[in-house]
């Protein structure tokens, strides 16, 4: 139902990297704007992105607030000159997203290698904990703060001189790897949330090698 | 429910290439890593690689570089085992695993791999 | 490579023992160790992971402890489902190893 010059929103999906999270739905709005409100299972709905003429709405604020609750959104759509206005049953048309469970269900941003540091045969390969949008006593949790040992990481190293791949884990963020000395090696490096079922593993870390600017070597 | 097939075993030549295939239902592979593991008759278990299907990275025992290839087929939602050079000590069950990042939780049946004149 | 060293190679036991397996690896394994149960003419079954967590399904007769280098699987009561073949596995580092096996037979 709805007033015969709006229509209702569609194809509702939630995009989501290290807890920054943003509604996204359809169509283009033709003489209509939306209202986006979102609430836990129990709570209140809360309005966001009022009377907007964008298909998204960051909702980044609201789900950090508890990363384990599950989330519902509805997108209402009003005539663009009338937002008064409401459907024929007397409410405005909306259309409700999927649930989502932040905890469960953000994606996993790139990883980054911070450093790397060469101590005879030994490397300790670092990995960068990714600062989130989460809050704890007015300060930013890291990933690692957020996910504590939910969160592996998965290390890639290789020879700069062939193609045979290692691989190490950790569930911290650093690997102490062995090497042979006088080689230089390639890194890279993947996070994975071993107990999800989706969105568990991340894309791989953008390749870095000895020799380049973030190691440190020490005999 | 999650199941893995393992097909294409049964008996080569010394020298021979055999494909090994394991088809995955329940799960996408792309979100797991897939392994290989073998049993010769009467011992145990050994580590052959793994792959992550989604960007193709592949980890090999190094005694199985050079013969060995892993690959996947995401859209088959398959892992393979490409064995060349076979030798009769590569006679063995080679099962597919599917691993989380923290253990492998399922198995599949194996495929038994004769290699012999 | 991490070499894993499983003791005893077999034993024989009555229902209703307690059993002790152990594994050493040569390094420090950060709890990236593994254990598993195999029947004849059976894939393997995960029993326990991260050292001490017990999988799913899995009777809590069966546990798993240890850090660092020595690691134990201990069944408390023996049960005559329990006779099988139970492996290690590392998988922290590349190449994963497995355990020389431990053969669980009926005294």
């Known amino acids: 139902s709805g007033t015969t010059n709006t229509v209702a929103a569609y194809n509702l999906t939630w995009k989501s990297t290290n807890f920054k999270t943003i509604l996204e739905w359809e169509p283009k709005p033709v003489n209509q704007v939306y209202t986006v409100q979102i609430s836990t299972k129990s709570g209140d709905w809360k309005s966001k992105c009022f009377y907007t003429t964008d298909t998204e709405c960051d909702l980044t604020d609201e789900i950090v607030k508890d990363v384990k609750q599950t989330y519902l959104a509805r997108v209402f759509s009003y005539p663009a000159g009338n937002v008064e206005s409401t459907g024929s049953a007397g409410e405005p048309l909306y259309e409700n997203s999927p649930e989502f469970t932040p905890y469960l269900e953000t994606n996993l941003g790139q990883p980054t290698i911070q450093s790397f540091e060469q101590v005879g045969t030994k490397v300790n390969v670092t990995v960068e904990d990714e600062r989130t949008l989460v809050r704890r006593n007015n300060t930013f949790l890291s990933l690692r703060d957020v996910f504590g040992k939910d969160l592996i990481y998965t290390l890639y190293y290789w020879k700069s001189s062939s193609s045979g791949k290692k691989t190490a884990k950790t569930n911290t963020n650093e690997f102490l790897i062995d090497v042979d000395k006088g080689e230089n090696y390639c890194f890279s490096v993947q996070a994975v949330i071993p107990s999800r079922t989706v969105n568990r593993k991340s894309t791989d870390s953008p390749v870095e090698c000895m020799g380049q600017e973030k190691g440190e070597f020490r005999e | 429910e999650v199941q893995l097939v393992e097909s294409g075993g049964g008996l080569v030549q010394p020298g021979g290439s055999l494909r090994l295939s394991c088809a995955a239902s329940g799960f996408n592979i792309k979100d797991y890593y897939m392994h290989w593991v073998r049993q010769a008759p009467g011992k145990g278990l050994e580590w052959v690689g793994w792959?992550?299907?989604?960007?193709?990275?592949?980890i090999y025992d190094p005694k199985f570089q050079d013969r060995f290839t892993i690959s996947a087929d995401t859209s088959k939602n398959t892992a393979y085992l490409q064995m060349n050079s076979l030798r009769a000590e590569d006679t063995a069950v080679y099962y597919c695993?599917?691993?989380?990042?923290?253990?492998?939780?399922?198995w599949g049946q194996g495929t038994l791999v004769t290699v012999s004149s | 490579d991490i070499q894993m060293t499983q003791s005893p190679s077999s034993l024989s036991a009555s229902v209703g023992d307690r059993v002790t397996i152990t594994c050493k690896g040569q390094r420090v394994l950060n709890s990236w160790l593994s254990w598993y149960q195999q029947k004849p003419g059976k894939a393997p079954k995960l029993l326990i992971y991260y050292a001490t967590s017990l999988a799913d399904g899995v009777p809590s007769r069966f546990s798993g402890s240890g850090s660092g280098t020595d690691f134990t699987l201990t069944i408390s009561s023996l049960q005559p489902e329990d006779f099988a073949t139970y492996y290690c596995?590392?998988?922290?580092?590349?190449?994963?190893?497995f355990g020389q096996g431990t053969k669980v037979e009926i005294k």
């Open positions: 596995l590392q998988h922290g580092e590349s190449p994963f190893t």
């Open positions: 792959i992550d299907p989604e960007n193709g990275n592949t």
């Open positions: 695993a599917r691993d989380t990042a923290a253990y492998f939780d399922y």
